[in-house]
């Protein structure tokens, strides 16, 4: 029986050109975690985290996407395309999957918002599919 | 230039073991990767059979787990596999290959000649 | 385990065809999906990986697209050299699986 709990960093704001980090953490339950998937609103990955095998960061954000801190993600350079829906997909063992949402807005530079993560935001917590 | 060569008996009875060891040359395995064990029946596709990490930790195929250990001989450079209880659907070539998942995601990017093992009385 | 799926299981084509071959995944797997050709008598070789990028030294022929459930693999210009069968393969989840294969023939 799936019994976690994923807390999020819930709905956040950061400034264009700016950064974010993007965290989530499971909870109530003692199921490994074999990996996490990082994936954008559009469905693309944007990284994996594999316990034993490390990081994979995709092609395509390798030079603005940074690991961690933890198992989170670290979005740099935003623009305004980054506004949007992010996923972070646990799979574990023996529970199965979990997930949990995110969404970013990314302000523009003149606008209110913060940067590093350190914007609005509003924890969420989610239950398994 | 990364090089990987499998070796081990080419028959193999039904009931016993299967054992097979993968040289690594142009590189330490410990220093980096996980090294990986894939095998392919006659004229069909390919099955992951499990990993061993540079740090000694190891995943097996859920399919095979009961069966399967991988392990490294890092004073020789070389990680080996083994597989018990063999029957005849164990016969394959057996492929090793290394997966270098920081740049290449779950693709294998370095592959072995493979070499066939064949389990008969 | 994520199941994939290829087809044509076999196909033929002449010397500078177009050739696409098409592998569906069992569930979304995103674009944690790569593409290896295999000569006859020979291991697998890396051509794409993450979906649609080439790994190094791949010709530029060779080329991958898709997300989700969905993948293609193309040859735009068939080349005799490239008689062989392909193989899709995921990494979303954490046991990798492969597709059953393409066997590709010159007409």
């Known amino acids: 029986m799936m019994t976690g709990t994923i807390e999020t960093t819930g709905n956040i704001s950061a400034k264009k050109g700016g950064s974010v980090i993007l965290q989530c953490h499971l909870s109530s339950t003692m199921a490994q975690v074999t990996q996490v998937n990082w994936e954008q609103h559009d469905h693309s990955l944007l990284a994996i985290r594999n316990a034993e095998l490390g990081w994979h960061i995709y092609p395509a954000f390798k030079d603005r996407v940074a690991p961690g801190p933890g198992l989170g993600l670290t979005l740099q350079s935003l623009t305004m395309n980054d506004t949007g829906e992010y996923f972070c997909t646990y799979h574990t063992y023996p529970d199965g999957t979990y997930r949990g949402r995110i969404f970013l807005e990314v302000l523009e530079s003149s606008g209110g918002g913060g940067a590093g993560g350190g914007g609005h935001h509003h924890h969420h917590h989610h239950h398994h599919h | 230039q990364v090089q990987l060569q499998e070796s081990g008996p080419g028959l193999v009875k039904p009931s016993e073991t299967l054992s097979l060891t993968c040289a690594v040359y142009g590189y330490s395995i410990t220093s980096g990767y996980s090294w990986h064990w894939i095998r392919q029946p006659p004229g069909k596709g390919l099955e992951w059979i499990g990993y061993v990490h540079y740090s000694g930790s190891t995943n097996y195929n859920p399919s095979l787990k009961s069966r399967v250990t991988i392990s490294v001989d890092t004073s020789k450079n070389q990680f080996s596999l083994k597989l018990s209880s063999v029957t005849a659907a164990d016969t394959a070539v057996y492929y090793c290959a290394r997966m270098d998942y920081g740049n290449y995601g779950g693709a294998m990017d370095y592959w072995g000649q493979g070499t066939l093992v064949t389990v008969s009385s | 385990d994520i199941q994939m799926t290829q087809s044509p299981s076999s196909l033929s084509a002449s010397v500078g065809d177009r050739v696409t071959i098409t592998c569906k995944a069992s569930?979304?797997?995103?674009?944690?999906v790569a593409w290896y050709q295999q000569k006859p008598g020979k291991a697998p070789k890396l051509l794409i990986y993450?979906?649609?990028y080439r790994y190094t030294g791949v010709p530029s022929r060779f080329s991958g697209s898709g997300s989700g459930t969905d993948f293609t693999f193309t040859i735009s210009s068939l080349q005799p050299e490239d008689i062989a069968t392909y193989y899709c393969q995921q990494y979303y989840s954490t046991q990798w699986t492969f597709g059953g294969g393409t066997k590709l023939e010159i007409k």
């Open positions: 993450s979906a649609s």
């Open positions: 569930q979304d797997v995103r674009t944690a």
